[in-house]
Interface confidence: medium
């Protein structure tokens, strides 16, 4: 028979044949052959793989570093990574929660929608068209672009979500 060019779900193609992927929580030891199944082994303590895979090494569980204010929210298993969170009163700087801050700053291009309180973190929002923020701040809202017209000037450079417009003198020449 013709060797396959594609395999079913949860299989992979190797040496012109389809082998079963290893299930989550297990790593690949050896590929299947004409006569043998794929050989897989469970991940060790403090390791995981969260997908059907052909990885030869499991991933290390995330370390929740107390020096960064982190603690374990959910212990990892052979199929899931450890989930970190921050100590009481601190907030994660990102979705991945790699470090903690007393309250988060909004990056350039984002403004503060709601200032942090004792229980909730800063809420940021993207600056809409016509507004900008050029600083990283835990307090500043998006600022409106300068209105060149009210200063009897014209826009020389368009504004962005991170920069104000640049105004310049009107061209005095008239046709």
């Amino acid at each position: 028979p013709e060797p396959p060019t594609a395999c079913r779900e949860k299989q992979y193609l190797i040496n012109s044949q389809c082998c079963s992927l290893c299930q989550p929580g297990q790593k690949l030891v050896s590929d299947c052959t004409e006569f043998t199944e794929t050989e897989c082994l469970p991940c060790g303590e403090s390791e995981f793989l969260d997908t059907w895979n052909r990885e030869t090494h499991c991933h290390q569980h995330k370390y929740c570093d107390p020096n960064l204010g982190l603690r374990v929210q959910q212990k990892g298993t052979s199929e899931t990574d450890t989930i970190c969170t921050c100590e009481e009163g601190w907030h994660c700087t990102s979705e991945a929660c790699e470090s903690c801050v007393l309250h988060r700053s909004c990056s350039p291009g984002f403004g503060v929608k709601q200032i942090a309180t004792g229980v909730s973190d800063t809420i940021c929002e993207p600056c809409p068209v016509g507004f900008f923020s050029n600083v990283s701040s835990a307090f500043e809202k998006c600022h409106p672009w300068t209105s060149c017209e009210t200063k009897d000037l014209v826009v020389q450079q368009a504004g962005t979500n991170k920069t104000d417009v640049v105004c310049g003198p009107q061209d005095r020449l008239r046709a």
Epitope: L68, C86, V101, S105
Partner: nanobody, 116 residues
Framework: EVQLLESGGGLVQPGGSLRLSCVAS????????MQWVRQAPGNGLEWISA????????YYADSVKGRFTISRDNSKNTLYLQMNSLRAEDTAVYYC?????????WGRGTLVTVSS
Amino acid sequence: EVQLLESGGGLVQPGGSLRLSCVASGFTFEWYEMQWVRQAPGNGLEWISAISGDGYRTYYADSVKGRFTISRDNSKNTLYLQMNSLRAEDTAVYYCAKELGYFDYWGRGTLVTVSS
């Protein structure tokens, strides 16, 4: 290396005033929003005030609004906190901070004790 040195703390009676100072070095002071944070005995850190890099915009926690005033002198790389109408619950170690990361550099703080 970032350094923040707070001073001005001490023992004061309820209703009294104090002015805290924080001298900064090791970074371009006027580029940064600066903050005052405090920690009362046995409590977590409490953010109390912040000021924009140019000094034009100030922010306060409800617990100190109307009593405390934050200011800065960028020519002297110094942050200030004027504290009026002090109460017993204002007793804490006061820190100035450049950023509020758990691992960021914090000064050693200055102790404010409000007691009769």
